[in-house]
């Protein structure tokens, strides 16, 4: 199957790499604008320069293009705990990330929130915290893993999945309850 090409891609494919077809005259191939610039005016004719202008502050283009406007710089989402790793330049968007000892949880492809890495209290670190993944903990005896925290088996109810991990403790609790009855 041939992938479906949009009108713009079809037009560009007629010209050699680094050039695009003039929107009013399909016999002319104009040179694309460098990253950090945008298309102000198409080239007037073959072999003549495209009029490209540098992006204004607060905007960028990260690759060669024939965009009529630069793209607006992204803003890091403070409400998601994001911090600015590097600020926007004319040829690169803002880079947002998380603080030290935090990881990213993605709500969608391009929206993430920063969370603190688990410390594995009452357990040991099985896998260290990474950029996009929390620490993986292994719990000590008498504790079970719930939402990546080691919780005491005394908080394990019979209906929960922790019963297998906490079985000896549950039996002991049940035993002491039984022995207390007359």
């Amino acid at each position: 199957l041939v992938p479906h090409l949009g009108d713009r891609e079809k037009r560009d494919s007629v010209c050699p790499q680094g050039k695009y077809i003039h929107p009013q005259n399909n016999s002319i191939c104009c040179t694309k604008c460098h990253k950090g610039t945008y298309l102000y005016n198409d080239c007037p004719g073959p072999g003549q320069d495209t009029d490209c202008r540098e992006c204004e502050s607060g905007s960028f283009t990260a690759s060669e293009n024939h965009l009529r406007h630069c793209l607006s710089c992204s803003k890091c989402r403070k409400e998601m705990g994001q911090v600015e790793i590097s600020s926007c330049t004319v040829d690169r968007d803002t880079v947002c990330g998380c603080r030290k000892n935090q990881y990213r949880h993605y709500w969608s492809e391009n929206l993430f929130q920063c969370f603190n890495c688990s410390l594995c209290l009452n357990g040991t670190v099985h896998l260290s915290c990474q950029e996009k993944q929390n620490t993986v903990c292994t719990c000590h005896a008498g504790f079970f893993l719930r939402e990546n925290e080691c919780v005491s088996c005394s908080n394990c109810k019979k209906s929960l999945e922790c019963t297998k991990l906490c079985l000896p403790q549950i039996e002991n609790v049940k035993g002491t309850e039984d022995s207390g009855t007359t």
Epitope: W107, S108, N110, E147
Partner: nanobody, 124 residues
Framework: EVQLLESGGGLVQPGGSLRLSCAAS????????MGWVRQAPGKGLEWVSF????????YYADSVKGRFTISRDNSKNTLYLQMNSLRAEDTAVYYC?????????????????WGQGTLVTVSS
């Protein structure tokens, strides 16, 4: 067909509580992150809260932090929003929404499906 049906809205006095529910069908509920968004009269859409697949990760807008609690029951295909200490400014239509990984969706509204909404009115 994906369906999200909200319920639990109504009229409540300031300081009161409400629990919203969202019954989901037509997709594998436990395989998707979910959220609540709201629209106050004459205002734009506002994120309220998100929850991941299991409840391990949650997000709350600053305006509702400490008052609202999002939860889910994957066995019942239901999303909840417990709203306490309600204020007049919480008056809005509340929508249950399914988060999406579709890159063509704008970051400000990363949902591919949402319900018809339930009206919450906070007034004395």
């Amino acid at each position: 067909e994906v369906q999200l049906l909200e319920s639990g809205g109504g009229l409540v006095q300031p300081g009161g509580s409400l629990r919203l529910s969202c019954a989901a069908s037509g997709f594998t509920f436990g395989g998707y992150q979910m959220g609540w968004v709201r629209q106050a009269p004459g205002k734009g859409l506002e994120w309220v809260s998100f929850i991941d697949f299991t409840g391990a990760h949650t997000y709350y807008a600053d305006s509702v932090k400490g008052r609202f609690t999002i939860s889910r029951d994957n066995s019942k295909n239901t999303l909840y929003l417990q709203m306490n200490s309600l204020r007049a400014e919480d008056t809005a239509v509340y929508y249950c929404a399914k988060l999406s990984d579709d890159l063509t969706l704008p970051e400000r509204f990363p949902f591919d499906y949402w319900g018809q909404g339930t009206l919450v009115t906070v007034s004395s």
